[in-house]
Interface confidence: low
Amino acid sequence: QGSTLSPTGRRTTKMPSVPLSSDPLPTHTTAFSPASISERENDFSETTPSLSSDNTSTQVSPDSLDNASAFNTTGVSSALTPHLPTHADSQTPSTGTDTQTPSGSAANTTLSPTPRSNDISDVPGERSTASTFPTDPISPLATTLIPARNSSAALPARTSNTTITANTSVSYLNASETTTPSPSGSTVISTPTIATTTSKPTCAEKYATIPVDYLYNNKTKLFTAKLNVNENVECTNNNHTHNICTNNEVLNLPECKEMNVFVSHNSCTDRHKELKLDVPPEVEKFQLDDCTPDVEANTTICLKWKIIETFACDKSKITYRFQCGNKTYNKEGIYLENLEPEYEYKCDSEILYNNHKYINITKLIKTDFGIPGQPQNVVCRHEDAHQGVITWNPPQRSFHNFTLCYVNKPAKKCLILDKHLTTYHLQNLKPYTNYSLSLHAYIIAKVQRNGTAATCNFTTESAPPSQVQNMIVSTSDNSMHVKCEVPRDVNGPTGLYHLEVEAGNTLVRNLSQSKCDFSVNNLQYSTYYNLKAYYHNGKYSGEPVILRESTSYNSKA
């Protein structure tokens, strides 16, 4: 039955043993390899049950999404082994005695977790109205897109697990041809014959429906057609000369070959049952691409099948299906929008050849990290003239670090702060300066995503101003004229210029004004004076600039 991923539970499925790449593959296998191997653990990497009621499937976990060729043999090989047949998979509707529940009927539920996530459109923008795969002999992909929440920021930003199932259950590539439907219209199930009368059935009756699996060997690039019947039958080709079946298998079939096989057995009479084999293309010729733009990878999943190499098969026989939750898309691509960031979503995709399942991949895709939240309870204040402090509580949602910017126009400085900090002391600030601070969390994922900034302001305390600049003294007989310019750093509110004039140790003048342009009159001629000019910013006096100058000799004497 279809299985469901819950946000916290862990689904388990029996797995076949997987040989390492150095081991020889079983003779008739379908071998696939992941494009890369990740160290992710505990992340719902088990195989989805196959699309039929009896299943052996092998997980490939995970591949990198970009250029995610499901079939490039570059990593650890996994082998898919033939299975025991359980149910004839015919193109004849099963309306009679078949009491099995199709596997797809178990888990057609809605997309979770977000109410926004129903906005799902097909590539390149059309909307599909189908809600499930039809419950026909091709068992539907029936899985539920329920994300597995994992808030650990230590995990890779956007990852996917890939499960590949091909030719491992009777629902894959069952190239059966019904020439004589049974009277009830039901699908004939191959079971050991129990003799109730002396007459044997005709071979056409007995083998009215023969499910065929096409098992691919990725080393030889050839297929084996496995006839799912309960006894060892004889097969001949058009020449009717020798048995071409070994253990009900026709070996070494190249892709796209069409041939008729005549099936017979001593338990049935009359002529042979004619069975048409129609071999699909090599599996490596399909590639599932991640088409998600990096900037949208936090809320979007885009997947598209591409044919990467030509083949001779009839392309009109190829159809694609995607199932994500209870939405079905009969196109080669999907574009799912408005998803939750940092959630694991599950999409099943399959390629059908001649209306028979051919390739099935389960993608477990973790959407990229979302935009971090805003830092909470942000408070900043000055500590003195040269220092300030900002405190905050961390934002919700994952993030990697903070960026703190502080601006005293026009200068701006930004720092990267460790994610564990909740306080930061700013040093070497300018006195009596207004600082605007902004703090945002960011995360580096497919792209860097910056959260909304929280802002605050403070003004540092005053400090002594620096010295006045460019002090000039001009002298005459009994006067001096002193000019200077504003200090480089006022370090406080606008204040006054001061000039002290001393003769020896005696203060003879103490002047202050808003402009540094002092006229000092009625001085002694031919006398040396010490001139001290400084700036007072309202709280502190600056260091004085001291010049020693003399008035002129009395020119009138």
Epitope: D290, P293, V295, I307
Partner: antibody, heavy 119, light 106 residues
């Protein structure tokens, strides 16, 4: 306005190497797949390479595979083409183009840069 | 890979003429076909994408059609600025351009 400006073309001897650059502006570069297309003198257009928005998917035709390397620097809004073991048949005007859809065609093209391969 | 055969390789026409250019793919390309216009010394310009979608700013006299392996670009009434070379491009499986069709003044 979307702008793509190629540079790095010039004269190179057979067997030599050249690195082409394409500076993008006027759009969110890391949203788009990019491609290089070339045109030999008097001939038609030939696709050279394509790269996904993140740089994770890369495609080449057989004619340049194992000789050319496409790359991108999203922080610098730049696309590159490293061309090694150049042959006479590689002589062409090389255009960079933005793909309008992840595997679509180019909806914005640069003016091209000429690569001359001659001894 | 997929081959694109474009025809004719050149044609002569007059202003006001209806012009048709065809592209044939070596296999079904499922309408993943674009048309480009290129003038001498200039970069190609996208006209039609995905068989029949007119790119932004392209006059409505250009139209595209087709499916499977056969595709057509039609210029309903040729204008003086339309004399150029036209290329088709398939992008279902990698990228392949057609050989080009040069539209000249008769």
């Amino acid at each position: 306005e979307v702008q793509l400006v190629e540079s790095g073309g010039g004269l190179v001897q057979p067997g030599g190497s050249l690195r082409l650059s394409c500076a993008a502006s006027g759009f969110t570069f890391n949203n788009y797949w990019m491609t290089w297309v070339r045109q030999a003198p008097g001939k038609g257009l030939e696709w050279v390479s394509s790269i996904s928005s993140s740089g994770g998917s890369i495609y080449y035709p057989d004619s340049v595979k194992d000789r050319f390397t496409i790359s991108r620097d999203n922080a610098k809004n730049s696309l590159y083409l490293q061309m090694n073991s150049l042959r006479a048949e590689d002589m062409a005007v090389y255009y960079c183009a933005r793909l309008y859809y992840y595997d679509g065609g180019g909806d914005a093209w640069g003016q091209g840069t000429l690569v001359t391969v001659s001894s | 890979g997929i081959q694109m055969t474009q025809s004719p390789s050149s044609l002569s026409a007059s202003v006001g003429d209806r012009v048709t250019i065809t592209c044939k793919a070596s296999q079904d390309i499922n309408k993943y076909l674009d048309w480009y216009q290129q003038k001498p010394g200039k970069a190609p310009k996208l006209l039609i994408y995905n068989t029949n979608n007119l790119h932004t700013g392209i006059p409505s006299r250009f139209s595209g059609s087709g499916s499977g392996t056969d595709y057509t670009l039609t210029i309903s009434s040729l204008q003086p600025e339309d004399f150029a070379t036209y290329y088709c491009l398939q992008h279902i499986s990698r990228w392949t351009f057609g050989g080009g069709t040069k539209v000249e003044i008769k």
